[in-house]
Every structure is written in C-alpha cells, then in structure tokens.
Amino acid sequence: MWNLLHETDSAVATARRPRWLCAGALVLAGGFFLLGFLFGWFIKSSSEATNITPKHNMKAFLDELKAENIKKFLHNFTQIPHLAGTEQNFQLAKQIQSQWKEFGLDSVELTHYDVLLSYPNKTHPNYISIINEDGNEIFNTSLFEPPPAGYENVSDIVPPFSAFSPQGMPEGDLVYVNYARTEDFFKLERDMKINCSGKIVIARYGKVFRGNKVKNAQLAGATGVILYSDPADYFAPGVKSYPDGWNLPGGGVQRGNILNLNGAGDPLTPGYPANEYAYRRGIAEAVGLPSIPVHPIGYYDAQKLLEKMGGSASPDSSWRGSLKVPYNVGPGFTGNFSTQKVKMHIHSTSEVTRIYNVIGTLRGAVEPDRYVILGGHRDSWVFGGIDPQSGAAVVHEIVRSFGTLKKEGWRPRRTILFASWDAEEFGLLGSTEWAEENSRLLQERGVAYINADSSIEGNYTLRVDCTPLMYSLVYNLTKELESPDEGFEGKSLYESWTKKSPSPEFSGMPRISKLGSGNDFEVFFQRLGIASGRARYTKNWETNKFSSYPLYHSVYETYELVEKFYDPMFKYHLTVAQVRGGMVFELANSVVLPFDCRDYAVVLRKYADKIYNISMKHPQEMKTYSVSFDSLFSAVKNFTEIASKFSERLRDFDKSNPILLRMMNDQLMFLERAFIDPLGLPDRPFYRHVIYAPSSHNKYAGESFPGIYDALFDIESKVDPSQAWGEVKRQISIATFTVQAAAETLSEVA
C-alpha cells in the first residue's frame, strides 16, 4: 500500500570512473585552482570579492521572495502523501532536484541511505479493544481517521500508528498517567503508591516528546502505552473543528515516532552512514527502540476508555483534561466494569528502506570551502500541510531567489548548501546519515546551519531558537524587515516580535530560546558543534495553552488548513522566508561572520547562576562532599574578558588583509565547535555539546549545562550519595574545562 523502496533499488546508482583518471584530473585542476584562487584573493578587495553591488545586495534577494510563489509551492507539495520510504516521496525528491537545477544551483544531487523505518501491517490493522470477561471485544478504537472532504479517494494515507512500536497484544488494567512525564510517574509511584507494572498506561499527548513518555512508561514496568490527544491540549476554546476551523476533531489522531535515539540517527548504524557497505546491528541491539507496544488514538476513542476508569481519583486539577470523564487514575475500570480489560493489537513492522536527501550547492566565490547550510525535511506523515511542506515551500522560494541572483552574475562569498531531508519523522534520519557521511568536511568547513521545518505553528508572532552567536544577527535582521502583523503596519518585525514575545531578562528585546532537539538541526548543533538556528511563526503561548498546533501529524494537516485558517495571504510564510533567507544571506555573504561571542559570555553566566542555584538546594551535601562552582564561575569570567577583547580586535583589524580576515572568521566559526566534548554526555555519546543538550526528560526542550543538570536531577533519591555528588563534581570540572578551553580559542593567536 505504501510502495516501499528497498535497498536493492539500483536505478539511482551512479556510474564510476576509473580512480586514476579522477585522481589525475584532481591534481591538475587542484593545482591551477589553488594558484588562481590565491592570486585572485590577494589582488581583490573584500567588497569586490563578494561582488556586492546595489543590485546584488540583501535587498535584491529579499525583494525577489514572493508570497504567491510560496503558496503555489505549498499547494504542489501537499496534494498526495509523502511518507518516508515511499515511491511518492522519491518522486518528490526528483521533482525538487529538477526544479533546483532550473532555479540555477551549480549542482543538485540525490544522496540515498538504507535505514530502519516502520509501517503498519497493510492487512492486519492496529487497534485497541475493551474486552469483557469472556474475551469478547465490546469496543474497538478506530482503524483510520475520517478523511477530509476532497481527499476521500486519495490512496496511501497511512493510518495513525506509533512508528517503531514493537508488535504485541498486551491485555490488562488501564492506568491513567497524565502526560507521562518524569514528574507524573513520581507522583503516581512515590506519592500515590500506584504500581504500573503489568499495566497498560494511557497518557495524553503534550508537554514533552512522545518518546520520553514511552521511555518513562517502560521504566515504570508498563506492558503497553496508549497515547491520546485531549481537547484540553488540542482544542482551543472558541474555534471550530476541521474542516470548519483549525481544531482537532474527535477522530483526529497524532502520528509520530516513539524512539529514544539520543542523536544516533539510523538505529542500526549509530555513528556511521547507512550506506551499501555499512555494518548493521541486529534488531535486538538497535538504538532507541521501544520494548512495549504503543498506539495513538483520538479523543472520541479516549472517552470510551477513560469514562469507565476507577481506582484512585486524579491527584489535582493539573491531571484533568476537558473530556467528560472522571480522570480517575485506576488501575482498572470502576465497579460494574471491573471485569473488563483493555487489549492492544499492534502488528506494525520495522524494515530497512531506502530514503533520499536532495543536496543543492551554490558555490561560494571567495571561500568555497566554508559552508552555510539551509535544510528542512520533505517527508510527511500524510499531506504535510504545515509539517513539513510549509517549510519546504519556503526553502524552495529561497532557492529560487538565490538562483535568480546567480543567473544575474552574483555569487555568495561562501558556499551555500540547500538540503531537502528525508525520514525526519522517523528520527531525523536523512539529515543525521548525511552528516555522518560528511562529518569530516562539516567539522572543518561548517559555518552555520539554518533549519527550515514548518514555517508556521500559529500566526501570532515570530519564534526563534538559536545559538547565542546568532542573537545579534537575528536582532539586526528583524529590525530591517517589515512586520506582517495587524496593528504593526509600517513597523519592524523586531518591534512586533518584542511587543508580543518580550525577553524575560532584557526589556525592549524579544525572547530567543535555547535549541533543544526534535528537528534536523540536531546532528549539526548537538553532535558537530556547528552554529545553528531556526525561526517560524508561532501562536500566543499566553492564551493558547494547547501543545503544538491541534492538527499536528493528523490527516487534516492539509493545504486548505493553511490557506483557509492560518495564512490566507501567505504573509507569515513570506516573513519566515525573509528571516531564514536573510540569515543565510548574511552568514554566506558578510565579510566578517555575523557572530557575536559576547552574547555567549552573557548566557554562560546566566546558565552558571542557574545550575549553581539548583545545586544550592542541597547546601549540606555541597558542604559534606566539598562541591564548589568557583572554578566554573572563574572560567566564565575568563571567557567574558577574552570575548570582550576579541570583539575589540574584531572591530579594529584590517579587513582588507585576507589572511587576517580568514583567521578571525575561523576563530568565530570554531567557537561553537570548542564547546564539543569528543566523549559526549554520560550515556548519550552523540550529544556532545557541553553547554546545550536536549533535556533528558523532554527531547524538544534544551537544557543548559546538561551534564551537571542530569547529575543533580533527583539526587536526593540516589542510593549512593557519595558517588552521586562525585559525578556532580566531575561534571562541573568538565564544564569548567570546556568553557576555559573555548575562551582560549578566542585569545590572540600569537
């Protein structure tokens, strides 16, 4: 039904030339190139080298971006499903390759990998039953979502499932576990003394990544997990359900993977690309797979399961959603229904399947060996109206605009790489495999990565998550862009953004958040230490408490959802294109990289204060085990002073001296890299950034000084306090060393 592509597909295998021919040609070409490159570099001034004329500046690039084109591209990308590993998504990859070539990129290649994906069984559907004492099924959950009008005859709509769930038919009493967060299980197990061992747990979606929910349930001893969307989280008051509004109907279900990969990429080839000669682990040794069956349902079906719940009452109002059910915790059903059980029927399969990235190159005129990357995924769960195609359509228009400038004779100073990633929904697989394959190039040449998944998750204001190195770039760029918001006509994007999403620390400035994970920047930032950022339009978090947007990963995420309810004029999409495209333009074209290391100094101090305050909740233990943060604060102080001096030198140095310019830019480029610990974080070898990592309790959220944070987490419950506080001290020393070492990369080189 989903026309899977397997590793045997040889249609895209490339012809090989004799190696000696390639090598000889390279030596000759390389020699001439080097001579010409050096000659050209020394005789040109920096401004001439980047070929910036009034016609070919950022304004020309931004003016070329058109809302109408983004709309057209979105429509084109959303007419059929583009599930990873399917023929339809391969065809879309080839279409994008062809169009990027037409737009004018120097080269556009498909790169394929054979990775572990997961699909429902076509003849044996997944569902959940309520069974009576005789084992008869008296209620079954839905087999698919009611298709939206106009899409009834579309084939290959994958039914809702939890990707990578193992097969199984567990049967037992139900326990309601709220959001299945770490603190929810603490409440259940420690305060309420409810044991989930041998039980099927039902958890509501929201607050944290679904994979963390499943991991927590597994650790609690559950035999299965049911995930559901509660109207409290996925139905905004006063808004109609799709197709009459943007809310989730009762039959709508959120798909998604439930892996705990911790940055590994393909579960069978951690650390290495899943290519033809890759060694693959057995399924039992695969990284991050869940061990218990998991299945998602909508709130109509959840109502049927929850309305019969007995046992303990919910501990407080934070455990109650909006359904007309008691939200009892269980275990099991109440009085009359106590003999009834819940049974899961999960028959999904995991299989090695071929995926395709599209990689486009626009070669830099002056520093072709410095890469600025704009990447977003192409694969969707169904139509992908928002996720990912609202992002892919923006990337497409950015490529078109850059291509137009190139056709007029312009080139960026640095090389720009454009990527359409595959299999993001299955664990960030396409981007991670490509980065694994190209890690040596990327760690030496990667200047920045800008992510481009969904352009919108609302239409209220801008949302940016990025490295502190990019703060000033984002502030300066948004001051130059016009706000699309009603009531801010003629005002800057910076102004509307600051008004609607103020920084909690600095008045008159907008909020910028930490990078977490759950998207394709992960490998670039958390593993490789390449400065990264992301931007999209978002909802009003003050008034809209629902998690993500209501129709996330459902069949109702259509073109019409965007065109009718979110962005009829595509003005928010255009603004996001200007922000993402503008960042790429500046990163690729500025003579001096637009990074400000002083902003890292500011946040390092803030993060050191925060982790110190967490530790100070245990003053007696800190005294007993001689735990001190003095060294960390000293390193942060050193970083601040060295960053300040570096910034002065950066302001004053001779920018017409290409060697000096390259030297200063390299210090800026490699600063993010300096925060990488080659050994990685404890039990998370692919999360190597010492300042930031995805939270161990929620992959979507970023945590600062994660090594120290995790060592301190729930430390009062550790059986061996001496060992636990020893680990805190070890993590403080690692953080101290890393901050000091990073500072020294900014020192004057001689």
């Epitope: 008296i138 209620f139 839905s142 087999l143 979502e145 009611p146 009762g250 039959g251 109509y300 079906d301």
Partner: nanobody, 127 residues
C-alpha cells in the same frame, strides 16, 4: 446530490438468507457512520444495526444479534446487511441511514441521530 439507494430486498422463506446493499453518493461516505433501520407493516421505525465510518465497531438490536451482519466497503461507497436465519417477524421495509455527525464513532448505548435516508427496500419473509 446526496442520496442513499437500497437494493437486494425480496421475498424469502423463513430460515433463508438475504443480502441488502445501500449505494451512497454525494457525500464523504468514508467519514460517516451508517445504520440500517426497518419498519414492519403497521408498526413504527425500529433501529437494526450500526457500523462506524471505519468498520471497526458494529452494534445490533437484540432481535437480530447473531443473525444479521452489517458491513461496508468504503472504496465502493456501499453499505451491506447480511441477513441469515430470517424469520417472519423480520418482514419490513429496510432503510439505510447516514449518521448526522461526521467522524463520530458511536457506542452501543448511544442515541442515534440520522440525517439522510434511503427510499427503502421491502423484505418479505414468508413460506
């Protein structure tokens, strides 16, 4: 035009079987639960069976449970009622009806709400 058209009725002997069909058009069939309802001569309407939009749940009135089977083929926009072990008291005009609520999956104890009916097909069980 939104319509439901039943077929397959006729005269049949007690103990025999009959299969009714209902062809739907003009609406998103795969998004709506559907029902069979009957009216015996001189009597009021009696609900017979319900099937959810996706076919996962089927509910039956007590007099027909174990003898009748409701099914659907969404690819053909068709609803079926397989009637086995027919009895004289099954004699009635059988109507298919569309549930009023899109995407709703009703339970056994729900109160059903129909908004579109077919013209009916007569089933006579007689020796």
């Amino acid at each position: 035009e939104v319509q439901l058209v039943e077929s397959g009725g006729g005269v049949v002997q007690p103990g025999r079987s009959l299969r009714l069909s209902c062809a739907a058009s003009g609406f998103s069939f795969s998004g709506y639960g559907t029902h069979w309802v009957r009216q015996a001569p001189g009597k009021g309407l009696e609900w017979v069976a319900y099937i959810s939009y996706d076919g996962s749940n089927k509910y039956y009135a007590a007099p027909v449970k174990g003898r009748f089977t409701i099914s659907r083929d969404n690819s053909k926009n068709t609803l079926y009622l397989q009637m086995n072990s027919l009895r004289a008291e099954d004699t009635a005009v059988y109507y298919c009806a569309k549930d009023a609520a899109w995407g709703l999956r009703l339970g056994e104890s729900s109160s059903y709400d129909f908004d579109i009916w077919g013209q009916g097909t007569m089933v006579t069980v007689s020796s």
